[in-house]
């Protein structure tokens, strides 16, 4: 995929942006006590464009799409207490902790790299 | 797909934008005289966000991605002259003529609706 676009010559005053915003995330599981954890969400406005196509195609279709998604994240275990469940007194859930966000190609799978 | 987002409560000063810009498109075919035609390209900054995931998933993954793409286009024949090609004196190419652009779900196939 081509590199993300941060600036466009046609719109010099416009910049792509993609931020990691602090959020409080509720982690829950049926029959267990929910936990609030501090996390981050990715939010932004990346550039996209679409140039008219032809048949037969003369070149590769000129369509570009960037999306604001995690650039670095890690998965942590959050343990929930489940009172009244003797068989399953505790439940482990994996939670994605987002570290950094960036504009990346829309089709791309978000990175889940450790630190 | 959820409807495109134009405003975000977290960023009240930010707006999604997606414009149809006039362009001159060169339509060519090997051995034929290229033609310049007036067309439009879509260009913009739509909103995207990504909320941390969990395993097992508690809810649907909260990932949203809009992209600036044709909302209305039609395909027209552009005929190229091919001097010196007795067998193929003319070549027809289909060219997408973009009418309007809008922020639409990233995975969506661009619309090729008539007027």
């Amino acid at each position: 995929a081509p590199p993300p676009i941060n600036k466009l010559a046609l719109f010099p005053d416009k910049s792509a942006w993609c931020e990691a915003k602090n959020i409080t995330q509720i982690v829950g599981h049926s029959g267990c006590e929910a936990k609030s954890i501090q996390n981050r969400a990715c939010l932004g406005q990346c550039f996209s464009y679409s140039v008219p196509n032809t048949f037969p195609q003369s070149t590769e279709s000129l369509v570009h799409c960037d999306s604001c998604m995690p650039a670095q994240s890690m998965w942590e275990i959050v343990t929930l207490e489940c009172p009244g469940h003797e068989e399953v007194p505790r439940v482990d859930k994996l939670v994605e902790k987002i570290v950094h966000c960036s504009c990346q190609a829309c089709g791309k799978e978000p990175s889940h790299e450790g630190l | 797909a959820p409807p495109p987002i134009n405003k975000l409560a977290l960023f009240p000063d930010k707006s999604a934008w997606c414009e149809a810009k006039n362009i001159t498109q060169i339509v060519g075919h090997s051995g034929c005289e290229a033609k310049s035609i007036q067309n439009r390209a879509c260009l913009g900054q739509c909103f995207s966000y990504s909320v941390p995931n969990t395993f097992p998933q508690s809810t649907e993954s909260l990932v949203h991605c809009d992209s600036c793409m044709p909302a209305q286009s039609m395909w027209e024949i552009v005929t190229l002259e091919c001097p010196g090609h007795e067998e193929v004196p003319r070549v027809d190419k289909l060219v997408e003529k973009i009418v309007h652009c809008s922020c639409q779900a990233c995975g969506k196939e661009p619309s090729h609706e008539g007027l």
């Epitope: 195609q57 | 039609m74 027209e76 193929v88 090729h112 008539g114």
Partner: antibody, heavy 121, light 110 residues
């Protein structure tokens, strides 16, 4: 002289995928001088154009069928194929493959003899 | 309902002349070339006319095509019994972004 021959099952069950192949003889698909098409004709009705393919693999589909249609080319076998997914009784028709006059849109100068496809359980 | 409008049927005696009309709009016939096809019973269509008025090799000059504005006409002179067939007009439609055909005209040679 170029000839086209359609082949494939004559009976397809509803919701399944219709698959047809057109074999080109007497000329090469990869010469690049022609567009290749699929066209269908419902019983006792007119003609409906389905889509185009070029030897390079570039395709263009009728927007009314686009979500269900895939046309592909195999230049090594001198064949091009049609796949139509999620078929219903409304897809029962004679299916023709055709060649356009040299790189002209909509002037089909050579046709296969057609193959009748019935969609029924 | 076809995008291009043709009369369902026409008839004439052997040796006579007949015309078949094809009516459309500016998004199809008005701005694109028209082709005509002959379909004999039980056979595949055969190209008679392309680029409004050109005949492929092997098509006799009894067949002619013309176009004016958003309508096209196929003419057949010196009618023969072997001309009994369905005739279709076809062109590109920019608004529909697709190739389109008329509903067909059945020619009967009396």
């Amino acid at each position: 002289q170029v000839q086209l021959q359609e082949s494939g099952p004559g009976l397809v069950k509803p919701s399944q995928t219709l698959s047809l192949t057109c074999t080109v003889s007497g000329g090469s698909i990869s010469s690049g001088g022609y567009y290749w098409s699929w066209i269908r004709q419902h019983p006792g009705k007119g003609l409906e154009w389905i889509g185009y393919i070029y030897y390079s693999g570039s395709t263009y589909y009728n927007p009314s069928l686009k979500s269900r249609v895939t046309i592909s080319v195999d230049t090594s076998k001198n064949q091009f194929s049609l796949k139509l997914s999620s078929v219903t009784a409304a897809d029962t028709a004679v299916y023709y493959c055709a060649r356009d006059a040299p790189l002209r849109i909509g002037a089909f100068d050579i046709w296969g003899q057609g193959t009748m496809v019935t969609v029924s359980s | 309902q076809s995008v291009l409008t043709q009369p369902p049927s026409v008839s004439a005696a052997p040796g006579q002349k007949v015309t078949i009309s094809c009516s459309g709009s500016s998004s199809n016939i008005g701005n694109n070339y028209v082709s005509w096809y002959q379909q004999l019973p039980g056979t595949a269509p055969k190209l008679l006319i392309y680029d409004n008025n050109k005949r492929p090799s092997g098509i006799p000059d009894r067949f002619s095509g013309s176009k004016s504005g958003t309508s096209a006409t196929l003419g057949i002179t010196r009618l023969q019994t072997g001309d009994e067939a369905d005739y279709y007009c076809g062109t590109w439609d920019s608004s529909l972004s697709a190739g389109v055909f008329g509903g067909g005209t059945k020619l009967t040679v009396l």
